[in-house]
């Protein structure tokens, strides 16, 4: 038998979290950021 489909509007939608560090020069230190879904938020 085929199964009846059960789903809901309450599924968890996962996004990729990407931490990155970028060297911006010898006297300026580094920028550390958190990218969520393509947008830098920190």
């Amino acid at each position: 038998d085929a199964e009846f489909r059960h789903d809901s509007g309450y599924e968890v939608h996962h996004q990729k979290l990407v931490f990155f560090a970028e060297d911006v020069g010898s006297n300026k230190g580094a920028i550390i950021g958190l990218m969520v879904g393509g947008v830098v938020i920190a």
Epitope: E3, F4, H6, S8, Y10
Partner: antibody
Framework: QVTLKESGPGLVKPTQTLSLTCSFS??????????VSWIRQPSGKGLEWLAH???????QYNPSLKSRLTISKDTSKNQVVLTITSVDPVDTATYYC???????????????WGQGTLLTVSS | DVVMTQTPLSLPVSLGDPASISCRAS???????????LEWYLQKPGQSPKLLIY???NRFSGVPDRFSGSGSGTDFTLKISRVEAEDVGVYFC?????????FGGGTKLELK
């Protein structure tokens, strides 16, 4: 509040094709997790599930009736339509449309039923 | 198709007494997602069925706590701890795991 109301031709002749309409309010069939089924009940007898349509237009049918049934939805009109071909007197029954809604993940139930519409197939 | 067999067919009960209805599935109705979609409905004369219990043992909103559901796999039970006059009608079990979805034949609860 959620309401569903069925309408149909009432009396049809054998071999004809008919459409039953479920008009609903209080929810949207474009909302993830929503669905509507048609269920019928011959007078004084048991219940038989016919077909179900989901919010994303996926459909499931009772295999024994699939060749004669088509379920469709018009989200803008808040309606679900069941079309039955080649009707026979054994199709005489009260037809209910029923909402199936999700309250949480994989936690869905047929929570609201219409009042039903009586279909009589007779020559 | 999954055959749902309800017993008894008729259940005469006195007010205030307990009542129990059995529902047996011809095969397991555990869904591949791990849930068991067994529901109980009450249909009063001249009305549409109303949901009492979903997923075996969960009372639907507004359903009195005298109603309880239990079971697993293929064997399920609806119990009413103390029958009231408003409980009269036909009770149906319903499996929503396998297509086609199928109902039990119904149990008519009546007052002695």
């Amino acid at each position: 509040q959620v309401t569903l109301k069925e309408s149909g031709p009432g009396l049809v002749k054998p071999t004809q094709t008919l459409s039953l309409t479920c008009s609903f309010s209080g929810f949207s069939l474009s909302t993830s997790g929503m669905g509507v089924s048609w269920i019928r009940q011959p007078s004084g007898k048991g219940l038989e599930w016919l077909a179900h349509i989901y919010w994303d237009d996926d459909k499931q049918y009772n295999p024994s009736l699939k060749s004669r049934l088509t379920i469709s939805k018009d989200t803008s009109k808040n309606q679900v339509v069941l079309t039955i071909t080649s009707v026979d007197p054994v199709d005489t029954a009260t037809y209910y449309c029923v909402r199936r809604a999700s309250s949480s993940r994989y936690d869905d139930q047929f929570d609201y039923w219409g009042q039903g519409t009586l279909l009589t197939v007779s020559s | 198709d999954v055959v749902m067999t309800q017993t008894p067919l008729s259940l005469p009960v006195s007010l205030g007494d307990p009542a129990s209805i059995s529902c047996r599935a011809s095969q397991s109705i555990v869904h591949s997602n791990g849930n068991t979609y067994l529901e109980w409905y009450l249909q009063k004369p001249g009305q549409s069925p109303k949901l009492l219990i979903y997923r075996v043992s969960n009372r639907f909103s507004g359903v009195p706590d005298r109603f309880s559901g239990s079971g697993s796999g293929t064997d399920f039970t609806l119990k009413i701890s103390r029958v009231e006059a408003e409980d009269v009608g036909v009770y149906f079990c319903f499996q929503v795991t396998h297509v086609p979805l199928t109902f039990g034949g119904g149990t008519k609860l009546e007052l002695k």
